[in-house]
């Protein structure tokens, strides 16, 4: 029978599919930075090249005895999870091992850097097919390790890293916190976060998705035919590295941005019980478990979007938070969220030639998050249309006046703190389709984009009664690009996108006697790409 | 995903310029020193000296050599363990923490990061 972890990540209808080239080989190469490995194990024999790379610290303790099977345990198991004959994900994939962890599973940032540089040098000396680098290790936050990952990713290498086993925010660890790395948390057979003794999987906004990481059967270094189960975010990352290898084998032209977006789009959503995570991390942690996406031939051409959260701004009055998309992605909208509700809104601005999403804290606020909606859309061209704050008078609509440009998102901010002003409606599709509507004292920013066949519409859902949140989802075939809260009588905490659902959060005043005009509304901008059609705004 | 983690960044007090070797680096240090926030994971004595992105390969080697020369003047032994160039310009150096202030004044230095442990997950 198929082990639970493989059944979970490769849907039954895909399990018969041939994921290597006609001769059974794979053009994708996976580099594993880990302990030494037992290359003679039946699971991985003939698939693994042990490079001469070795950069490890001395083992601690005078009484430490190097036992080959113990030294090889972690790396051998992971090599088996990636490409093992029976228990592996990408069964035909060739793997290169670099030793950066000693017999106690310890390494150094510097050793890892030298390992990453070794891979880059190998790539320059002998260019090959797509490369995947698996980093089943974690240390404290390291700017230089993150930078090295970023630079390697820019050369076309896909890096997959363990989120870490510290039951903590993955952003505090490296390489997990590197934005260019695909960071993987661990779930068990019940799709719940993995507990490891008193600790467990890391979580938070630096995690891209989760994958099986508990009691994973794989190659054991005890003997060449032995198997054992191991647990951790390393195992989870190995599953995703295997999935990525399969995706690249089918379609070697896939970029890192496309791979990440497709992993997110086709993951299993909302199966993880978020109560396991600290309360303040639940909104930031993705509720998705990896599965092998279908090939691009079956699903190509669609608009792919993901949500990127900023770091918390901190509580100072002028604090800001900035969320950035990957270089290939387009920022289609920007929103903000504050647990206290004290925020001065959000806006898109250019920093160093890149559009970023910025959220502004307000006096007395505990801090804000910026929430960017980052999308992949061929030949897209976006611009921001701003209306400065009106000192008095009616609301000022901002629309996309350029030909064939459609509204993909609305942002707004106040130069001065005005909580009452925030309770005024912002975006209305009725009567004024395709425009952002501001009000006095708010600056309004419309995100207007042009791409072949891009069409968008606003979808709203309002709740008149007491509620902490209102949601609205884009229907099948449409992708959420923008999300706003249109407040009723309550103070809005902000809005953010969770996959294809727009979530408007409010601090409920508890009044049950509201009129429908006072209803809190979640307003989603839903778009789709139909390459044959012209860009258009769809009137609901 | 993250810009700066829970991370220690320190501006170090700099030694005075007292001999001709140091006069070459008479600019004020804007470089910072960084180290792991978890003390038990730190590896003091080994540092990655990270240079500005546009630094040329020859300048990397010259900077490492200059640091060695300056340090030797003061009686400090430095071991340049590795020179980085393919992913970022910089070098890995084994040296006394006493020399950090001096190293931060070197031309082209963006920041210096103390080495730290990573662990199998």
């Amino acid at each position: 029978s198929i082990p639970w972890n493989l059944e979970r990540i490769i849907p039954a209808w895909q399990q018969t599919e041939e994921d290597s080239s006609p001769d059974g080989s794979s053009q994708v190469e996976v580099y594993l930075l880990d302990t030494s490995i037992q290359s003679g194990h039946r699971e991985i024999e003939g698939r693994v090249t042990i490079t001469d790379f070795n950069s490890v610290p001395e083992e601690d303790g005078t009484r430490f005895h190097r036992q080959a099977s113990k030294c090889d345990s972690h790396g051998t198991h992971l090599a088996g999870v990636v490409s093992g004959r029976d228990a592996g994900v990408a069964k035909g994939t060739s793997l290169h091992s670099l030793r950066v962890l000693n017999c106690q599973g310890k390494g150094t940032v510097s050793g890892t850097l030298i390992g990453l540089e070794f891979i880059r040098k190998s790539q320059l000396i002998q260019p090959s097919g797509p490369l995947v680098v698996l980093l089943p290790l974690a240390g404290g936050y390291s700017r230089i390790l993150n930078t090295a990952c970023q630079r390697l990713a820019r050369t076309g290498v896909v890096l997959v890293a363990a989120a870490g086993n510290f039951r903590d925010d993955a952003c505090l660890y490296s390489p997990a916190s590197a934005p260019e790395v695909i960071t993987v948390g661990a779930t068990n057979a019940q799709d719940q976060p993995v507990t490891l003794g008193t600790l467990g999987t890391n979580f938070g906004r630096c995690v891209d998705l989760f994958a099986p990481g508990k009691d994973i059967i794989g190659a054991s270094s005890d003997c060449s035919t032995c198997y054992m189960s191991q647990s951790g975010t390393s195992q989870a990352a190995a599953h995703v590295a295997g999935i990525v290898a399969m995706m690249l084998n089918r379609d070697p032209a896939l970029t890192l941005a496309e791979l990440r977006q497709r992993l997110i789009l086709f993951s299993t959503k909302d199966v993880i019980n978020m109560a396991w995570f600290p309360e303040d991390q639940r909104v930031l942690t993705p509720n998705r478990v990896a599965t092998l996406p279908p090939s691009t031939q079956e699903t190509g051409g669609q608009l792919l979007c993901r949500t990127v959260w900023s770091a918390h701004s901190g509580p100072t009055r002028t604090a800001t938070a900035t969320a950035r998309c990957a270089p290939e992605e387009e920022l289609l909208s920007c929103s903000s969220f504050s647990r206290s509700g004290r925020r001065r809104g959000d806006r898109i601005e250019a920093i160093g030639g890149q559009q970023v999403c910025k959220a502004l804290n307000a006096f007395g606020g505990e801090g804000v998050y910026a929430v960017a909606r980052c999308c992949l859309l061929p030949r897209v061209n976006c611009s921001i249309h701003n209306t400065p704050a009106a000192r008095a008078g009616p609301q000022t609509p901002v629309h996309c006046h350029q030909k064939d440009h459609v509204l993909t998102g609305c942002s707004f901010h106040w130069e001065v703190e005005n909580l009452r002003a925030q309770q005024q409606p912002l975006l209305r599709s009725r009567h004024q389709p395709g425009q952002c509507v501001g009000h006095q004292e708010a600056s309004v920013h419309a995100s207007c984009c042009h791409a072949p066949g891009l069409e968008c519409k606003i979808k709203e859902h309002g709740i008149a009664g007491p509620a902490e949140q209102v949601t609205v989802a884009c229907e099948a075939g449409w992708t959420l690009t923008g999300c706003n809260v249109l407040p009723g009588a309550s103070l809005p905490l902000g809005a953010y996108s969770v996959d294809n659902v727009c979530v408007a959060r409010i601090r409920d005043a508890g009044r049950a006697d509201r009129t429908s005009e006072e209803a809190t509304v979640a307003a989603a901008i839903c778009c789709r790409s139909r390459p044959s059609a012209k860009a258009s705004w769809v009137h609901q | 995903q993250d810009e700066d983690g829970d991370y220690e960044e320190l501006m170090l007090a700099l030694p005075s310029q007292e001999d001709s070797l140091v006069d070459e680096a008479s600019h004020v240090a804007t470089a910072t020193f960084r180290r792991c926030s978890k003390e038990a994971w730190r590896l003091p004595g080994t540092y990655v000296v990270v240079l500005m992105e546009e630094t040329q390969r020859l300048q990397v080697e010259q900077t490492a050599h200059r640091l060695q020369t300056w340090a030797a003047r003061r009686g400090y032994v430095i071991k340049v363990l590795h020179v980085f160039y393919d992913l970022f310009p910089g070098f890995l150096v084994k040296m006394s923490s006493d020399l950090l202030g001096l190293a931060l004044k070197l031309p082209h230095v963006e920041y210096i990061e103390e080495d730290s442990l990573v662990f199998a997950q």
Partner: antibody, heavy 114, light 108 residues
Framework: QVQLVESGGGLVQPGGSLRLSCAAS????????MHWVRQAPGKGLEWVSN????????YYADSVKGRFTISRDNSKNTLYLQMNSLRAEDTAVYYC???????WGQGTLVTVSS | DIVLTQSPATLSLSPGERATLSCRAS???????LAWYQQKPGQAPRLLIY???SRATGVPARFSGSGSGTDFTLTISSLEPEDFAVYYC?????????FGQGTKVEIK
């Protein structure tokens, strides 16, 4: 100009103690490693000990380990060598030297004899 | 420990002659930390050469150093009367710091 002046030498009985000082001037003392080197009468140079600029790192020759202690007071620009359990073979001229041994003091004679 | 062996123990030469002093290490020495000193009776040693080949401030050009790995040489191209003294090589790249036993350059 750089100057190093040793003091504290003298005659001491075996098993006794002595504390040598080296007063430094003309340079930023705390930037430099400092060393003690000795020379027995008619013999060659023997390195004894050194200390880093901050005082955080010290090294000793095996022949003096556990008996001698090097220290420094950067506020006073002074280097010290505390010598305990002295032996006849410790008889020598003791020099302090700066950094890369580019400047030396004139030396102070320590005689261990009963 | 790195043992430095100097040869010859004594070198008897006349002023104007060329002196070649050798220093051999028991294991490879980082040449950045190889130095030569001159010592005259009743005086402290004086640094002549650092980094195996760089002349210290104020040292005449007739003194030169060369070598790498385990073999190093101090050359005095033309001996002056004030050059007759004891010369020591030293390595300070590894602890313990070690000196050679010295070469005495005397007037023939």
């Amino acid at each position: 100009q750089v100057q190093l002046v040793e003091s504290g030498g003298g005659l001491v009985q075996p098993g006794g103690s002595l504390r040598l000082s080296c007063a430094a001037s003309g340079f930023t003392f705390s930037d430099y490693y400092m060393h003690w080197v000795r020379q027995a009468p008619g013999k060659g140079l023997e390195w004894v000990s050194n200390i880093s600029g901050s005082g955080s790192t010290t090294y000793y020759a095996d022949s003096v380990k556990g008996r001698f202690t090097i220290s420094r007071d950067n506020s006073k620009n002074t280097l010290y060598l505390q010598m305990n359990s002295l032996r006849a073979e410790d008889t020598a001229v003791y020099y302090c030297a700066r950094g890369m041994f580019d400047f030396w003091g004139q030396g102070t004679l320590v005689t261990v004899s009963s | 420990d790195i043992v430095l062996t100097q040869s010859p123990a004594t070198l008897s030469l006349s002023p104007g002659e060329r002196a070649t002093l050798s220093c051999r290490a028991s294991q490879s020495v980082n040449s950045n930390y190889l130095a030569w000193y001159q010592q005259k009776p009743g005086q402290a040693p004086r640094l002549l050469i650092y980094g195996a080949s760089s002349r210290a401030t104020g040292v005449p050009a007739r003194f030169s150093g060369s070598g790498s790995g385990t073999d190093f040489t101090l050359t005095i191209s033309s001996l002056e009367p004030e050059d007759f003294a004891v010369y020591y090589c030293q390595q300070w790249g590894d602890v313990p710091i070690t000196f050679g036993q010295g070469t005495k350059v005397e007037i023939k």
